[in-house]
Amino acid sequence: ELCDDDPPEIPHATFKAMAYKEGTMLNCECKRGFRRIKSGSLYMLCTGNSSHSSWDNQCQCTSSATRNTTKQVTPQPEEQKERKTTEMQSPMQPVDQASLPGHCREPPPWENEATERIYHFVVGQMVYYQCVQGYRALHRGPAESVCKMTHGKTRWTQPQLICTGEMETSQFPGEEKPQASPEGRPESETSCLVTTTDFQIQTEMAATMETSIFTTEYQ
């Protein structure tokens, strides 16, 4: 089941998925002046079995005289089955690379890909939040968000993170990149009174990013 929305935005914070659940799709988008090769895949798909997961398909971009304006669509399950499998593994990966069962790593970059990567997340996907440089974290709970299915609808849990502008004495003390976990932390889901404001995307930009404009897609 695909998640309907993007993960929530937290002021002065950035999020990342450290691994992608099987079923996740990544659009094959190319930067301006390039387009997908004619026989190229529309998307990559995280697939696998109990012991190994990898990305099916490979995104490839080629130079184009005109800008590629083809709108990306979420592929249907029957389309997914027909696509050729090409394992995407980065060369020279260190041996200590963590591998989470049922999850794929970030796909390696491909030539002339678009700046933003558009993922179609599935239920159970987790993303992790960190305050950007110049801000420190005030935690009320987990600094993560999980896409959950509640009463037939998908929603992202609200990360319990506040980033305050107080400068730290040392840069990012004790911070560590979180290890991806296949299960979200338990939380009460007895109530179905979920309103859109619970996961409204906040558009306040981090102070260090104020000169740039980004889409709300995961980059």
Epitope: P7, E9, T14, F15, K16, M18, K31, S90, P91, P94, D96, Q97, A98, R105, E106, P107, P108, P109, W110, E111, N112, E113, A114, T115, E116, R117, Q130, C131, V132, Q133, Q171, F172, E175, E176, K177, M205, A206, T208, M209, T211, S212, F214, Y218, Q219
Partner: nanobody, 130 residues
């Protein structure tokens, strides 16, 4: 598949300088943090420096602050590491690496960890003689 190619390594005397370069032809720089790790013989690979390809912000490990300078040329798809005042502790194989930026094009230093990079170069050897 896109590749990272390092150059500029070599033998230098203590106190000397070297300039490493990482060529990443075809890489969409403004979607990545691009930078350097190093691995000395018998030691773990450690993050040295990176530059955010979107906003140009930089990070340096404490051990190289004030001596190393990272820079990028997005038009040429290269990232350089100017290494000054080299000492024997800097001797290592230096690897170029890239890691996807987070949302809003931001990146934090705690993500610059060896197990989590998206792509690696093959490395270039830096030897510092005393």
């Amino acid at each position: 598949q896109l590749q990272l190619v390092e150059s500029g390594g070599g033998l230098v005397q203590a106190g000397g300088s070297l300039r490493l370069s990482c060529a990443a032809s075809g890489l969409t720089f403004d979607g990545y943090a691009i930078g350097w790790f190093r691995q000395a013989s018998g030691k773990e690979r450690e993050g040295v420096s990176y530059i955010n390809g979107r906003d140009g912000s930089t990070f340096y490990a404490d051990s190289v602050k004030g001596r190393f300078i990272i820079s990028s040329d997005n038009a040429k798809n290269t990232v350089d590491l100017q290494m000054n005042s080299l000492n024997p502790d800097d001797a290592a194989v230096y690897y170029c690496a890239v890691d996807r930026l987070g949302s809003r094009g931001a990146y934090v230093s705690s993500w610059w960890r060896s197990p989590d990079m998206d792509l690696w170069g093959k490395g270039t050897l830096v030897t510092v003689s005393s």
